[in-house]
């Protein structure tokens, strides 16, 4: 359909990260149209011939889809008419990283926006008290990271202290030969203190906290994606 004389519509994307082996979302929103058949969504990837995904006339059109995305993409169909063109990407691969373009055409106009999609692996750390050690120690474990992250310890009581001398970190390659298990042990811990294990790469930052007292152990963890 023609859009001559129509204006450019605002398309907005958000840099995001995909966790290898899991499902991810490439976010894109646009000025909505009131009719579904007026909306065309095309997702393209830099360096790839063919389309990542196309949605038009209320249906997916995968006739020009590149084979690396076959069976792995979907739009949130019920949300298209309210301006959501985000793409669901199943089973994220390391090779999915790159620059994507979300291109929108509606009966009101057209527009596009790029997004950087980073891929890697990130997971929540779990800290446990290691009672087997000769002195009381803490063991921080996170099952899946890539690229190799940095690990640092911190403590509420000894703020600013460098724990590298009293900790030991190892990275163990997982069976798929890409992601790694992170294990870090902090020795000589004191009771009635809160310790934090911080794992970070260029995609994500995860923190595990543990508070050890005479009567109980309290844990908390959080994961934050770095949209840099």
């Amino acid at each position: 359909f023609g859009i001559s004389g129509k204006h450019f519509i605002t398309v907005t994307t958000f840099t995001s990260a995909g966790n290898i082996g899991e499902d991810g979302t490439l976010s894109c929103t646009f000025e909505p149209d009131i009719k579904l058949n007026g909306i065309v969504i095309q997702w393209l990837k830099e360096g790839i011939k063919g389309l990542v995904h196309e949605f038009k006339e209320g249906k997916d059109d995968l006739s020009q889809q590149h084979e690396m995305f076959r069976g792995r993409t979907a739009v949130f169909a019920d949300q298209v008419v309210v301006g959501n063109a985000s793409l669901r990407l199943k089973n994220v691969q390391l090779t999915d990283a790159g620059t994507y373009t979300c291109y929108i055409r509606t009966s009101k106009g057209k527009g596009n926006a790029n997004l950087e999609y980073k891929t890697g692996a990130f997971s929540m750390p779990e800290i446990n008290v290691d009672y087997n050690a000769s002195s009381e120690s803490l063991r921080c474990e996170a099952p899946r990271w890539f690229p190799q992250p940095t690990v640092a310890w911190a403590s509420q009581v000894d703020q600013g202290a460098n724990f590298s001398e009293v900790s030991n970190t190892s990275f163990e390659l997982n069976s798929e030969n890409v992601t790694m298990k992170v294990v870090s042990v902090l020795y000589n811990v004191t009771i009635n203190n809160t310790y934090s294990c911080m794992i970070e790469n260029d995609i994500a930052k995860a923190t595990g906290d543990i508070k050890v007292t005479d009567s109980e152990v309290k844990r908390r963890s959080q994961l934050q994606l770095l949209n840099s």
Partner: antibody, heavy 117, light 107 residues
């Protein structure tokens, strides 16, 4: 929470005009289409037109072109529909409704317009 | 314009019974159909969007299905508050159009 509050009932003489308002709150007024729907007494629903306040784009049902004119004032988050050259068949409840997360997910309470000589 | 035809016009049922309301589009509208419930003196309320997505807060006895030209709203077991008029509506193309409505009344 999202709310659409419409102006009160109107009684008009044939040939006159009426302007119905719909004040929106609880969401970003400029980011979503506002629609107007007619329901004549004992009848079904009829879509009149819609406006996108972000850029004042409008879409009209051909049947209501020349009858209805819709506008939006972003500073007050209010949409308006003016009906001109009123006739008895324009007697109806008029609803404003918006599409925030789904189609027509929020509705105004309706404005009864009665055309009578 | 796309014509939406609802049937039956009236459905007389008892509480606890299953209600099946149909809506037929005059051309393919993909999944772009919503269902609304309207009670006397009230504005319509969204029940189902995009043919089968139950709107927030709508009881799970309401379900929608269909794509293309044939759509169904099912109320698995009628509650007293479900007796009302139900409308289907397409947002595939303009003008947006509604069906004529199905009145579900107490038998």
């Amino acid at each position: 929470q999202v709310q659409l509050v419409q102006s009160g009932a109107e009684v008009k003489k044939p040939g006159a005009s009426v302007k119905v308002s719909c004040k929106a709150s609880g969401y970003t007024f400029t980011s979503y289409w506002m629609h107007w729907v007619k329901q004549a007494p004992g009848q079904g629903l009829e879509w009149i037109a819609a406006i996108y306040p972000g850029n004042s784009d409008t879409d009209y049902n051909q049947k209501f072109k020349g009858k209805a004119k819709i506008t939006a004032v972003t500073s007050t988050s209010t949409a308006y529909m003016e009906l001109s050259s009123l006739r008895s068949e324009d007697t109806a409840v008029y609803y404003c409704t918006t599409t925030v997360a789904h189609y027509f997910d929020y509705w105004g309470q309706g404005t009864m317009v009665t055309v009578s000589s | 314009e796309i014509v939406m035809t609802q049937s039956p016009a009236t459905l007389s049922l008892s509480p606890g019974e299953r209600a099946t309301l149909t809506c037929k589009a005059s051309q393919d509208v993909s999944f772009a159909v919503a269902w609304y419930q309207q009670k006397p003196g009230q504005a319509p309320k969204l029940l189902i969007s995009s043919a089968s997505y139950r709107y927030t807060g709508v009881p799970d006895r309401f379900s929608g299905s269909g794509s293309g030209t044939d759509f169904t709203l099912t109320i698995s077991s009628l509650e007293p508050e479900d007796f009302a008029v139900y409308y289907c509506q397409q947002h595939y193309n303009t003008p947006l159009t509604f069906g004529g409505g199905t009145k579900v009344e107490i038998k």
